[in-house]
């Protein structure tokens, strides 16, 4: 069987992961969109997913998952914040499709977390510290009925973080070293 | 096809107000953020601001340079984005685009020339 | 503010010629950075977003790479349309801000 290609991203406890998933054929735009788990000898799980249809710059948060979806660009982002050891594995993002089964984005992304700040910023992220509110409302993720349902939180209509972000206004609390939202939103 | 035209630039005087509109046709505008980018005549590319979409409930944002001097709009039943300008300074002389984000933008207007001088 | 800092501020070349361009962001951006060309009198036209992505119909001769703090433009062979001038932007958080630009000369 052919491997499939990974992509290693070493990171901190407390750091986010902040990745691109390149889908550019326009006709997944709208298409609904998930992050999953990859476990040994384990079907994939998901973890969180866009709205059905996927709107586009619309975050969407799922714990400390926040998945966004750039329409006019062909990427999901998708961010995993204040990074937990216990979060390291393998993960994939894919799009739904059915009846057909989900049509998985290269590459795989394999997270590594590791004990321990690093007081230097990482590629992926800066020292500044952003407090944010997490939205009181929330509803049910749409996400396929063979995986796990979660609650989802929408974005708030306006950031209260101290430093906004461009596109998301999702705030979380506790959380440092966040990556500010692209403002391409 | 798909564009964006922007109008209402012109010579004002310091102190004045100037409304610049920008007409976008041939996609959804209701789906999409839209923002303001300004250009001084011989200077590179400056943000000015953002109003993003529908689905964000039309919020906004705004470079500290134009916070509280300009407000950005949009009507959507009319395609339409606005950019209000009040209490102009000579520094805020540019070419003014209208862009479609939010990752790169990917379209933008011809730009319209605002001349802040007395 | 996130800064953008832009090298070289411009560049003569030739037909033919390979060009980098590099854009440096006072703090970490991930890969929320996009590439534009801008000639005299147009707006500018995107070629590169998320920093490797090559924008539709922009030719391959153009590349990006990079990602945290350190970016970069490679033209792979310059041609006569090439020349211009090219801009940086970060559009990983709020004020978006550009590089100060990179005129691309006639050597």
């Known amino acids: 069987a052919t491997k499939l290609t990974e992509e290693k991203y070493e990171l901190k406890e407390g750091q986010t992961l902040d990745v691109k998933c390149d889908y550019t054929l326009e006709k997944f735009a709208s298409s609904q969109k998930a992050w999953q788990i990859i476990r040994d000898g384990e079907m994939p799980k998901t973890l969180a997913c866009t709205e059905r249809p996927s709107k586009n710059s619309h975050p969407v948060q799922v714990g400390r998952i926040i998945l966004e979806d750039y329409h006019d660009h062909g990427l999901l982002r998708v961010r995993m914040v204040n990074l937990q050891v216990e979060d390291s594995g393998l993960y994939q993002c894919v799009i739904y499709q059915p009846p057909k089964e989900p049509h998985m984005l290269f590459d795989r992304i394999r997270l590594v977390v590791t004990k321990g700040f690093s007081g230097t910023p990482g590629s992926n992220e800066n020292s500044t510290q952003n407090v944010y509110k997490i939205p009181p409302t929330t509803t049910k993720a749409l996400c396929p009925l063979y995986t796990s349902p979660r609650t989802v939180t929408q974005a708030p209509p306006k950031s209260t973080a101290d430093v906004s972000t461009p596109d998301s206004e999702i705030n979380l609390t506790n959380v440092t070293d966040i990556i500010r939202v692209p403002v391409f939103n | 096809e798909v564009q964006l035209v922007e109008s209402g630039g012109g010579l004002v005087q310091p102190g004045g107000s100037l409304r610049l509109s920008c007409a976008a046709s041939?996609?959804?505008?209701?789906?999409?953020?839209m923002d303001w980018v300004r250009q001084a005549p011989g200077k590179g590319l400056e943000w000015v601001g953002r109003t993003r979409n529908k689905a964000n409930s039309y919020t906004t944002e705004y470079a500290a340079s134009v916070k509280g001097r300009f407000t950005i709009s949009r009507d959507d039943s009319k395609n339409s984005l606005y950019l209000q300008m009040n209490s102009l300074k000579t520094e805020d002389t540019a070419v003014y685009y209208c862009?479609?984000?939010?990752?790169?933008?990917?379209?933008w207007g011809q730009g319209t020339l605002v001349t802040v001088s007395s | 503010d996130i800064q953008m800092t832009q090298s070289p501020s411009s560049v003569s070349a030739s037909v033919g010629d390979r060009v980098t361009i590099t854009c440096r962001a006072s703090?970490?951006?991930?890969?929320?950075l996009a590439w534009y060309q801008q000639k005299p009198g147009k707006a500018p036209k995107l070629l590169i977003y998320a920093a490797s992505n090559l924008q539709s119909g922009v030719p391959s001769r153009f590349s990006g790479s990079g990602s945290g703090t350190d970016f970069t433009l490679t033209i792979s062979s310059l041609q006569p349309e090439d020349f211009a001038t090219y801009y940086c932007?970060?559009?990983?958080?709020?004020?978006?801000?550009f590089g100060g630009g990179t005129k691309v000369e006639i050597k």
């Open positions: 041939g996609f959804t505008f209701s789906d999409h953020h």
């Open positions: 932007q970060q559009a990983n958080s709020f004020p978006l801000t």
């Open positions: 703090q970490g951006i991930s890969s929320w």
């Open positions: 862009a479609r984000g939010p990752l790169g933008y990917k379209l």
